[in-house]
């Protein structure tokens, strides 16, 4: 039975040209995290595998840095980076948990963090 929940940084905003950390945290389960995928709806950004380490998709290699922890740092942000990002936690024995973050990249300096929220 899947008892865990994913807590994410929720809806976040950042300035064009800046950087942002995408973070998810799995709680309320003793399941072992064996892999975390970072994805957009149509493309994979990065994978952190417990045995194989980090893999960054070639199309993001210049602008994505692994970490901190199981998170992902996006750099040199453009307006085209606005959208949804998914953290997919592969766990044993529970299965797969998913969290969602919406990032808005702003032209001006009015960027600030939104509220935290949870996806069960």
């Amino acid at each position: 039975m899947m008892t865990g929940t994913i807590e994410t940084t929720g809806n976040i905003s950042a300035e064009k040209g800046g950087s942002i950390i995408l973070q998810c945290h799995l709680s309320s389960t003793t399941a072992q995290v064996t892999q975390v995928n970072w994805e957009q709806q149509d493309q994979l950004l990065a994978i952190c595998n417990a045995d194989l380490g980090w893999h960054i998709s070639p199309s993001f290699k210049d602008r994505v840095a692994p970490g901190p922890g199981l998170g992902l740092t996006l750099q040199s942000l453009t307006v085209n980076d606005t959208g949804e990002y998914f953290c997919i936690y592969h766990t044993y024995p529970d299965g797969t948990y998913t969290g969602r973050i919406f990032l808005e990249v702003l032209e001006s300096s009015v960027a600030e963090h939104g509220a935290r929220f949870q996806i069960p």
Epitope: E39, Q41, D42, Q43, I47
Partner: antibody
Framework: QVQLQESGPGLVKPSQTLSLTCTVS?????????WNWIRQPPGKGLEWMGY???????RYNPSLKSRITISRDTSKNQFSLKFSSVTAADTAVYYC???????????WGQGTLVTVSS | DIQMTQSPSSLSTSVGDRVTITCKAS??????VAWYQQKPGKAPKLLIY???YRYTGVPSRFSGSGSGTDFTFTISSVQPEDFATYYC?????????FGQGTRLEIK
């Protein structure tokens, strides 16, 4: 439990437009996920054609992009495929499918065979 | 596009045998490979995602492994209901692509 069901004409003439609809039950197509079309010519492998996301964004296979349109009717909880200028090579079983965030496909319709012939 | 090449294209085996199918990607897809089972006249069924993770309800005799460009799908002890065609799929980048299939037949 989400269920998908394809419908549309089983026979289309060459050069015409193929039109198919996928009716989804048990889940709102505007709630989440991306809703896909995948086809399989008789005796051959599978080809991903494109999707429409819960928010209405579309993404198409570049090899088909000039001929394909995926749209939706949220009031009927349906999404549709229009595929133009068909030839005999487009004869296939057409499946609708719901993609997981990680881009694997857990949910499929039963498929509908479309034959392109005059 | 990323090409997925499966081998063999067909395989004759007996109930109780161990069977292995391979899939080779034309470029590094890390662990982003899924496996499906398809029976005649039916839609594909997801068995494995992310190279080695069994989908909900899939029996433990089905397993997957591999990373990079080389992937393996194994049935540890073939059951009568396992005779079908199996496909690999890369879920690394669009357009998502499938292998040409491996048909598992009764010897």
């Amino acid at each position: 439990q989400v269920q998908l069901q394809e419908s549309g004409p089983g026979l289309v003439k060459p050069s015409q437009t193929l039109s198919l609809t996928c009716t989804v039950s048990g889940y709102s197509i505007t709630s989440d996920y991306a809703w896909n079309w995948i086809r399989q010519p008789p005796g051959k492998g599978l080809e991903w054609m494109g999707y429409i996301s819960y928010s209405g964004n579309t993404r198409y296979n570049p090899s088909l992009k000039s001929r394909i349109t995926i749209s939706r009717d949220t009031s009927k909880n349906q999404f549709s495929l229009k595929f133009s200028s068909v030839t005999a090579a487009d004869t296939a079983v057409y499946y609708c499918s719901r993609k997981y965030y990680g881009s694997w496909f857990p949910y499929w319709g039963q498929g509908t065979l479309v034959t392109v012939s005059s | 596009d990323i090409q997925m090449t499966q081998s063999p294209s067909s395989l004759s085996t007996s109930v109780g045998d161990r069977v292995t199918i391979t899939c080779k990607a034309s470029q590094d897809v890390f662990t982003a490979v899924a496996w499906y089972q398809q029976k005649p006249g039916k839609a594909p069924k997801l068995l494995i995602y992310s190279a080695s993770y069994r989908y909900t309800g899939v029996p433990s005799r089905f397993s997957g492994s591999g990373s990079g460009t080389d992937f393996t799908f194994t049935i540890s002890s073939v059951q009568p209901e396992d005779f079908a065609t199996y496909y690999c799929q890369q879920h690394y980048s669009t357009p998502w692509t499938f292998g040409q299939g491996t048909r598992l037949e009764i010897k």
